[in-house]
């Protein structure tokens, strides 16, 4: 879920000041410090699976 | 009403540790970013930390860089900071704010702050 | 970021130029401009350099872009006599200028 307000962004991406375009925030895993990724908001939860057959 | 309201501050000698919580009521916590920002007295605004709504990237001033931590509990809808290493020039008014995020940049909603005062 | 002046002395009713100045350019998106009473925690009036948060009057305007950024007050009432500073996004820190006192001339 993205930060509600005016956002041009797509679901699950972000906008990055200093590149000056949206992001996608699924990048943030592994460059977690970017500017863009403080715009990521909490991932929706893993879908349920059971755990059995 | 939207609302973030503030604890933990006080007196502490140089060297000690201190938390300062943060309680957000009244908006949907994990959608938006939190940040720190402090205010020496009779001197202007200093940020010293953001944290995202997942709380997976944190951001810090250099000025606290290692000795300071933010963090979230987002079921309890809490931003918390701990101060280690603490120094007379962190003396100050410490606020917390949540952050617009996303295509604006901003802090949209503040708490009341709370007084962190470092000295022997 | 560098704002000018530090202190505007002013009457009510007169109009009021901020000036807040970056070093290298700013993303508009980023900047932002909040107003800050004796006491108070600050409040946010301007964000994206030029949309006027929620509740803030028009008598405020925000305008700029690149590296010169501008706040005015149309007619200074009353309640307007504070400190105001410019803040910016980027390089994934947040950055405040040094702040203008308007005051009661």
């Known amino acids: 879920e993205q930060a509600p307000g005016t956002a041009p962004c797509s679901r699950g991406s972000s906008w990055s000041a200093d590149l000056d375009k949206c992001m996608d925030c699924a990048s943030c895993r592994a460059r977690p410090h970017s500017d863009f990724c403080l715009g990521c908001a909490a991932a929706p939860p893993a879908p349920f699976r059971l755990l059995w057959p | 009403q939207v609302q973030l309201v503030q604890s933990g501050g006080g007196l502490v000698k140089p060297g000690g540790s201190l938390r300062l919580s943060c309680a957000a009521s009244?908006?949907?916590?994990?959608?938006?970013?939190m940040s720190w920002v402090r205010q020496a007295p009779g001197k202007g605004l200093e940020w010293v930390s953001a944290?995202?709504?997942?709380?997976?990237?944190?951001y810090y001033a250099d000025s606290v860089k290692g000795r300071f931590t933010i963090s979230r509990d987002n079921p309890k809808n809490t931003l918390y900071l701990q101060m280690n290493s603490l120094r007379a020039e962190d003396t100050a008014v410490y606020y917390c704010?949540?952050?617009?995020?996303?295509?604006?940049?901003?802090?949209?909603?503040w708490g009341q702050g709370t007084l962190v005062t470092v000295s022997s | 970021l560098t704002q000018s002046p530090g202190t505007l002395s002013l009457s009510p009713g007169e109009r009021a130029t901020l000036s807040c100045r970056a070093s290298q350019s700013v993303s508009s998106r980023s900047l932002a401009w909040y107003q800050q009473k004796p006491g108070q925690a600050p409040r946010l009036l301007i964000y994206?350099?030029?949309t006027r948060a929620t509740g803030i009057p028009d008598r405020f305007s925000g305008s700029g872009s690149g590296t010169d950024f501008t706040l005015t007050i149309s007619r200074l009432e009353p309640e307007d006599f504070a400190v105001y500073y410019c803040q910016q996004y980027g390089s994934s820190r947040f950055t405040f200028g040094g702040g203008t006192k308007v005051e009661i001339k």
């Open positions: 009244g908006f949907t916590f994990t959608s938006y970013a």
């Open positions: 944290i995202s709504g997942s709380g997976g990237s944190t």
């Open positions: 994206g350099a030029s």
């Open positions: 704010a949540r952050v617009r995020a996303n295509y604006y940049y901003g802090m949209d909603v």
